[in-house]
C-alpha cells in the first residue's frame, strides 16, 4: 500500500536502532572512503528528519523517495570530487539515474587497509564506554569493504559481535574468550559476503529471472514438501528482497525480509516441518536461521520425474505455450528430489532439458528425440562429483595450507597474467573449501563445494573485470554464472603466456617476516610460490615442492638464528641461486 511518507513508514516498521544501522550501512557502501564520523553525522541528520516525518507525514520533503533523500545527503558532502573523482558526476543526474550511477561506482576491492582487530583490553574498554558507537564502527568498517554485503545479515553479525563482547569482556581472560568466537563470526561473515555478491552479480548480469531460478532450486531442495505454488511465492518474495538489497534499497530490503520471515513462520504447515526452532527466535536471528535451515525430510512417495517430463504427450505443448512455468516446474521437481546436488548443477540440468526440448519439439517425432534426455544428464552429474572426490582426497592428504598451495599452482598456470595478490587471495579462499566442505557427510559435499567455489570464482571475475589481463579468465567470466566453475576447472596451462623474468628481489626476504602472524607468513610464502610459477609455468609439482621446502627450511633456520638479519642477508642469495638451479 502507498504511504504518504516512505521514510516515516520505514522508520516505524524497522524501529530506530535498525533504521540507523541500515542507513549507516547504505552510506558506507556508497561512499566507501568517508570516515565513520562523517557518516555518523549524516545518519543522525537522516534519523532526526525521519522522526519529524513520523510526527507529521505532511511536513516538508517527507513525501520524497528514499533515493532522493539519501542521494541529496550524499551529494551535499563537502570535497566530494576531491575524494571520489568521477563519482561526483552522479550528483548532476536526477533519480533514478543518480542512484544507478552510485551503484556503478561501488568498488569491490577498495584500497582500504585490512580491518585490524584491536587488542582485547582496548576493545572491551571502548565497547563498555559506548556500545552504540563501537557497533557503528563495526557496521561502517565491514560495509565499506563489502559494498554488497546483505544489510539485514550485517545487522545480525553486529548483534552476534555485541553478544560476544558482552560475554567475553566480563571474563578474566578476555583474549582467549574473544579470539575464537570473533574469528568464527568473521569467517561466517566473509562467506556471507561472497555468497551475496554472487546473488547481486546474478541479478545485475542476468536479471530477476536468473535469480528466481536460483531461488526456486534452492528453496525446492530445502522445502521438498511445499508445493510448486508455495515455492514460487517464496522465490518471488526472496527475489524482491535481494533485488532491493543489491540495488541499495536497504530499508525496503530489511523490511521485506522481516515480512517474508513472518509469512514463513505463519505458514509452516505448508512449507516445512523444520521451521519452528527458527520461528521462536527474535527477528534478526529468526531470518538468519531460516536462511540456513536444514532440509525438510523428502516425501517418501515421489513419482519418477519421467512421468511428467518425458513420458507425457503434452511435453512440447507445455513447453511451447508456457515455457517458463514448465521449466520452473521441472526445476522444482528435480531439485526437491536432489538435496545432494549443487544449485549450479541443478540449473545446468534445467538448461540441458530446455535445450533438448528446443531442439526436439521442432522435429517430426519429439518423444523419440527427448526420450533419452534424463540419461544425457549423467555426464553433467559425474563431472562435479569427480571434482569433489579429487579435491577432497587432495585436501585430506595435504591439509588446508598445502591444498591452497596446490590450487595456487593450478590457477597460476591457468591464468598467469592475473596479479599475484589476486591469485593468492583466490587460492586461499578456494582452498578453504576443503575445511568447509570436505568434512561434511557425503550427501552434503557436492552442494557445499560447488556453490562455494562458484561464489569465490565470481569474485575472481569481478576483480578481473576491473583490469582484464587473461583471455582464459575473460572467456570463463563471460559465460553464464552456472557454467563458470566447470569452465575454470577445464582450463589448462596457458600456452600463450611468456614466462616472467627471474627477479632476485621477488624472492628476497628480511627478518621482519619472522614476527608476522602465521597467516601473513603463509601469504608471503604463497606470493613467492605464485611468482615461481609465473617464472616457470611448466615446472613440475616435484620441482616446486623442492623449492618450497627449501624456502620453508630457510625461514625456519633464519628466524631461529641469534643474528637474524645476517642470516637473511647471507643465506637469502644462496636460496635464490638454489631456486634458479632447481627450476632450470
Amino acid at each position: 500500500e502507498a504511504h504518504k511518507s516512505e521514510i516515516a513508514h520505514r522508520y516505524n516498521d524497522l524501529g530506530e536502532q535498525h533504521f540507523k544501522g541500515l542507513v549507516l550501512i547504505a552510506f558506507s557502501q556508497y561512499l566507501q572512503k568517508c570516515s565513520y564520523d562523517e557518516h555518523a553525522k549524516l545518519v543522525q541528520e537522516v534519523t532526526d528528519f525521519a522522526k519529524t516525518c513520523v510526527a507529521d507525514e505532511s511536513a516538508a520533503n517527507c513525501d520524497k523517495s528514499l533515493h532522493t533523500l539519501f542521494g541529496d545527503k550524499l551529494c551535499a558532502i563537502p570535497n566530494l570530487r576531491e575524494n571520489y573523482g568521477e563519482l561526483a558526476d552522479c550528483c548532476t543526474k536526477q533519480e533514478p539515474e543518480r542512484n544507478e550511477c552510485f551503484l556503478q561506482h561501488k568498488d569491490d576491492n577498495p584500497s582500504l587497509p585490512p580491518f585490524e582487530r584491536p587488542e582485547a583490553e582496548a576493545m572491551c574498554t571502548s565497547f563498555k564506554e559506548n556500545p552504540t558507537t563501537f557497533m557503528g564502527h563495526y557496521l561502517h568498517e565491514v560495509a565499506r569493504r563489502h559494498p554488497y554485503f546483505y544489510a539485514p545479515e550485517l545487522l545480525y553479525y553486529a548483534e552476534q559481535y555485541n553478544e560476544i563482547l558482552t560475554q567475553c569482556c566480563a571474563e578474566a581472560d578476555k583474549e582467549s574468550c574473544l579470539t575464537p568466537k570473533l574469528d568464527g563470526v568473521k569467517e561466517k561473515a566473509l562467506v556471507s559476503s561472497v555468497r551475496q555478491r554472487m546473488k547481486c552479480s546474478s541479478m545485475q548480469k542476468f536479471g530477476e529471472r536468473a535469480f528466481k531460478a536460483w531461488a526456486v532450486a534452492r528453496l525446492s531442495q530445502t522445502f521438498p514438501n511445499a508445493d510448486f505454488a508455495e515455492i514460487t511465492k517464496l522465490a518471488t518474495d526472496l527475489t524482491k528482497v535481494n533485488k532491493e538489497c543489491c540495488h541499495g534499497d536497504l530499508l525496503e530490503c530489511a523490511d521485506d525480509r522481516a515480512e517474508l520471515a513472518k509469512y514463513m513462520c505463519e505458514n509452516q504447515a505448508t512449507i516445512s516441518s523444520k521451521l519452528q526452532t527458527c520461528c521462536d527466535k527474535p527477528l534478526l536471528k529468526k531470518a538468519h536461521c531460516l536462511s540456513e535451515v536444514e532440509h525438510d525430510t523428502m516425501p517418501a512417495d515421489l513419482p519418477a520425474i519421467a512421468a511428467d517430463f518425458v513420458e507425457d504427450q503434452e511435453v512440447c505443448k507445455n513447453y511451447a505455450e508456457a515455457k517458463d512455468v514448465f521449466l520452473g516446474t521441472f526445476l522444482y521437481e528435480y531439485s526437491r528430489r536432489h538435496p545432494d546436488y549443487s544449485v549450479s548443477l541443478l540449473l545446468r540440468l534445467a538448461k540441458k532439458y530446455e535445450a533438448t526440448l528446443e531442439k526436439c519439439c521442432a522435429e517430426a517425432n519429439p518423444p523419440a528425440c527427448y526420450g533419452t534426455v534424463l540419461a544425457e544428464f549423467q555426464p553433467l552429474v559425474e563431472e562435479p562429483k569427480n571434482l569433489v572426490k579429487t579435491n577432497c582426497d587432495l585436501y585430506e592428504k595435504l591439509g588446508e595450507y598445502g591444498f591452497q598451495n596446490a590450487i595456487l599452482v593450478r590457477y597460476t598456470q591457468k591464468a598467469p597474467q592475473v596479479s599475484t595478490p589476486t591469485l593468492v587471495e583466490a587460492a586461499r579462499n578456494l582452498g578453504r573449501v576443503g575445511t568447509k566442505c570436505c568434512t561434511l557427510p557425503e550427501d552434503q559435499r557436492l552442494p557445499c563445494v560447488e556453490d562455494y567455489l562458484s561464489a569465490i570464482l565470481n569474485r575472481v571475475c569481478l576483480l578481473h573485470e576491473k583490469t582484464p589481463v587473461s583471455e582464459h579468465v575473460t572467456k570463463c567470466c563471460s559465460g553464464s554464472l552456472v557454467e563458470r566453475r566447470p569452465c575454470f576447472s577445464a582450463l589448462t596451462v596457458d600456452e600463450t603466456y611468456v614466462p616472467k623474468e627471474f627477479k632476485a628481489e621477488t624472492f628476497t626476504f628480511h627478518s621482519d617476516i619472522c614476527t608476522l602472524p602465521e597467516k601473513e607468513k603463509q601469504i608471503k610464502k604463497q606470493t613467492a610460490l605464485a611468482e615461481l610459477v609465473k617464472h616457470k609455468p611448466k615446472a613440475t609439482a616435484e620441482q616446486l615442492k623442492t623449492v618450497m621446502d627449501d624456502f620453508a627450511q630457510f625461514l625456519d633456520t633464519c628466524c631461529k638464528a641469534a643474528d637474524k638479519d645476517t642470516c637473511f642477508s647471507t643465506e637469502g642469495p644462496n636460496l635464490v641461486t638454489r631456486c634458479k638451479d632447481a627450476l632450470a
Epitope: 508445493d227 510448486f228 505454488a229 513419482p303 504427450q313 505455450e321 508456457a322 512455468v325 516446474t329
Partner: nanobody, 126 residues
C-alpha cells in the same frame, strides 16, 4: 488441504449437453491446473480435459476434442466442463482432480493426482 466438490451430472439424451462444475478450496487454486477424469463401469479412470492455473492453456483427450470445453472462474474458485454432442460412450462418473500448486497438466496419469472430488454421474441414454 485441497477440497473439490463436483456437481451438474445427470441423465441426458445422446446429442444433448450438460455443464459440470467443480468447486475448489485451496489457497493457490487460481495458480493450480485442474483436470477432469472419468471412469466408466469396469474401466480405468481416464483423462478428459484439463486447464492451466495462472496460464492460459487447455488440454483435451482426443475423444472429446471439439465437443467438450473446459473453463474456470477464479472469482468463484470454480472449474467448469461444458459437454456438448454427448454420446452413450461418454457415460461415466466424472471427477475433478488437482495436484496442489501445479500450474500445468504435466501428466494424465491418475495416480499422480493426490486430490479428488467424490464424482458426479453422467448418463447418456435415450
Amino acid at each position: 488441504e485441497v477440497q473439490l466438490l463436483e456437481s451438474g451430472g445427470g441423465l441426458v439424451q445422446p446429442g444433448g449437453s450438460l455443464r459440470l462444475s467443480c468447486a475448489a478450496s485451496y489457497r493457490y487454486i487460481d495458480e493450480t491446473a485442474v483436470a477432469w477424469f472419468r471412469q466408466a463401469p469396469g474401466k480405468e479412470r481416464e483423462f478428459v480435459a484439463g486447464i492451466g492455473g495462472g496460464v492460459d492453456i487447455t488440454y483435451y483427450a482426443d475423444s472429446v476434442k471439439g465437443r467438450f470445453t473446459i473453463s474456470r472462474d477464479n472469482s468463484k474458485n470454480t472449474l467448469y466442463l461444458q459437454m456438448n454432442s454427448l454420446r452413450p460412450e461418454d457415460t461415466a462418473v466424472y471427477y475433478c482432480a488437482a495436484r496442489p500448486g501445479r500450474p500445468l497438466i504435466t501428466s494424465k496419469v491418475a495416480d499422480l493426482y493426490p486430490y479428488w472430488g467424490q464424482g458426479t454421474l453422467v448418463t447418456v441414454s435415450s
